[in-house]
């Protein structure tokens, strides 16, 4: 048999080998496609099937506009002028080239050593589904699940049967200072069909910058608490990846597991003192917050003591 590839919506003519070019002809076309459950023999006189497959005067079969449901097998059996039976067999596959793929929501820049979403490549209106591939500086990117992660999604339109593909690329650049170029391409996987490429995007990779500032938040505000009360200290830091946070009281490290939150339940006078947190970032070393003062008093009507949380009484200290 012969393999035929036809574009969706385009006409297709299949010739019936051995059939005389003009009547009288002895021929039979039958098909087994998405429109049939078994073999359907077409009437030479024509009929309701003519809208999808019509026998032409020369014995060929015309598919006026091929669709997904027309994929399948077409066979003609003809008797030539010498009385010999000749058979033709076609395997028909259809395809649709989608619109040019696009990278949506592209990143503006990348940060070294951390996961960065580069963007999402979208292709709409393909058949069969095809594949999306990412390229870095013109070379094919092979996802390894660690430094290069690709999340794919394929959807099929309920009416047209055409596919929409989405591919989200996340990378962990190893070093800053570079300007990698990313692009995405769609391939149907058909012979003699070139891939469709997106416009490339060039991104700057920066080193992870120092944290913009550490905020030490204290609850209750002002750091004044009655005996038996609870104090919560939170070290808020805007850095990726989140750094390790250790705690210092009165200049000495507290022997606690690293945590951005320090909880002091049922405080007593022994918990009074000056607290600060230290954030340790892999590429920038330690960074200490401004201190806050915790005081345990019987009455909560005293103003904040010298060296306690700033005069605003907001319970927040920020390092610009």
């Amino acid at each position: 048999g012969q393999n035929i590839t036809a574009r969706i919506g385009e006409p297709l003519v299949l010739s019936c080998k051995g059939a005389p070019k003009k009547p009288p002809q002895q021929l039979e076309w039958k098909l087994n496609t998405g429109r049939t459950e078994a073999w359907k023999v077409l009437s030479p006189q024509g009929g309701p099937w003519d809208s999808v497959a019509r026998i032409l005067p020369n014995g060929s079969l015309l598919l006026p506009a091929t669709g997904i449901v027309d994929e399948g097998t077409f066979r003609c059996r003809a008797t030539n002028r010498r009385g010999k039976e000749v058979k033709s067999n076609y395997r028909v596959r259809v395809y649709q080239i989608p619109g040019k793929p696009e990278i949506v929501d592209p990143a503006s820049e990348l940060t070294a050593s951390v996961p960065n979403k580069v963007g999402t490549c979208v292709s709409e209106g393909s058949y069969p589904a095809g594949t999306l591939s990412w390229h870095l500086d013109g070379k094919l990117l092979i996802p390894d699940g660690k430094e290069t992660l690709v999340k794919e999604e394929t959807r099929r339109h309920p009416e047209t049967g055409l596919f929409t593909l989405r591919s989200e690329l996340t990378v962990i650049p190893t070093q800053g200072g570079t300007h990698p170029t990313f692009s995405c391409s769609f391939s149907l996987g058909l012979p003699r069909r070139r891939p469709l490429n997106t416009a490339p995007i060039q991104l700057r990779v920066r080193e992870p910058g120092p944290p913009e500032g550490i905020q030490l938040l204290v609850e209750p505000e002002g750091g004044i608490v009655a005996p038996g009360g609870t104090v919560t200290l939170t070290c808020a830091i805007s850095a990726q990846p989140p750094p390790q946070v250790h705690w210092i009281k009165d200049g000495a490290p507290l022997p606690l597991a690293p945590s951005p939150v320090l909880l002091l339940p049922e405080v007593g006078h022994e918990d009074e003192g000056t607290y600060s947190c230290v954030a340790t970032h892999p590429s920038h070393g330690p960074q200490e917050s401004p201190p806050v003062s915790i005081r345990v008093t019987e009455t909560g009507d005293e103003g904040p003591a010298e060296g306690s949380v700033g005069e605003s009484g907001l319970g927040t200290l920020a390092l610009a």
Epitope: R35, T36, E37, A38, K40, S43, Q45, G46, G47, P48, W49, D50, S51, V52, R54
Partner: antibody, heavy 119, light 107 residues
Amino acid sequence: EVQLVESGGGLVQPGGSLRLSCAASGFTFNNYWMTWVRQAPGKGLEWVASIDNSGDNTYYPDSVKDRFTISRDNAKNSLYLQMNSLRAEDTAVYYCARGGDITTGFDYWGQGTLVTVSS
Amino acid sequence: DIQMTQSPSSLSASVGDRVTITCRASQDVGIYVNWFQQKPGKAPRRLIYRATNLADGVPSRFSGSRSGTDFTLTISSLQPEDFATYYCLEFDEHPLTFGGGTKVEIK
């Protein structure tokens, strides 16, 4: 909204001729096959003629072949049935219907026009 | 030519009844069968297309099924507005053939 409106029915003598029209609106007329179906008084439905969307191919049952001609004017969104050599048994309500091929069957029908063949 | 043998030709039923109408094709017509409802003095209205698919705007109490060359229209719970005549149609081959019709009357 799809609308099919038939006209041209009436009383005609046996052997006479009549031309029915069907005005279509609310859809892209030249995308569809069109069909005439008839119903004799108190009887069932009978297929009369079909035409493909281009108008190049027409189809009839033996009962009307060589007497009836279906045609269409895609520019005017109109379907026609030319009926010649009319017989008493052609008396029926004639319906215009959208479709007639395997993709549609008949999905929309007009309200019909009555043709009476009698002397 | 294909014959579509529809049965019964008439039936009496009450509101709420389950009603089944059958058409048998004399040869394989695939899925290419429609069902229509017709009320006196009105044009037919398509209920089911391609044997099993409910047409737009048709209540879900109507359903179509197929077993080989046997096609069935079922009304799960008959409503007062369902008293009418029902026809099947094969549109797989010319001449296109309708069943003889089934008149559903009030018991």
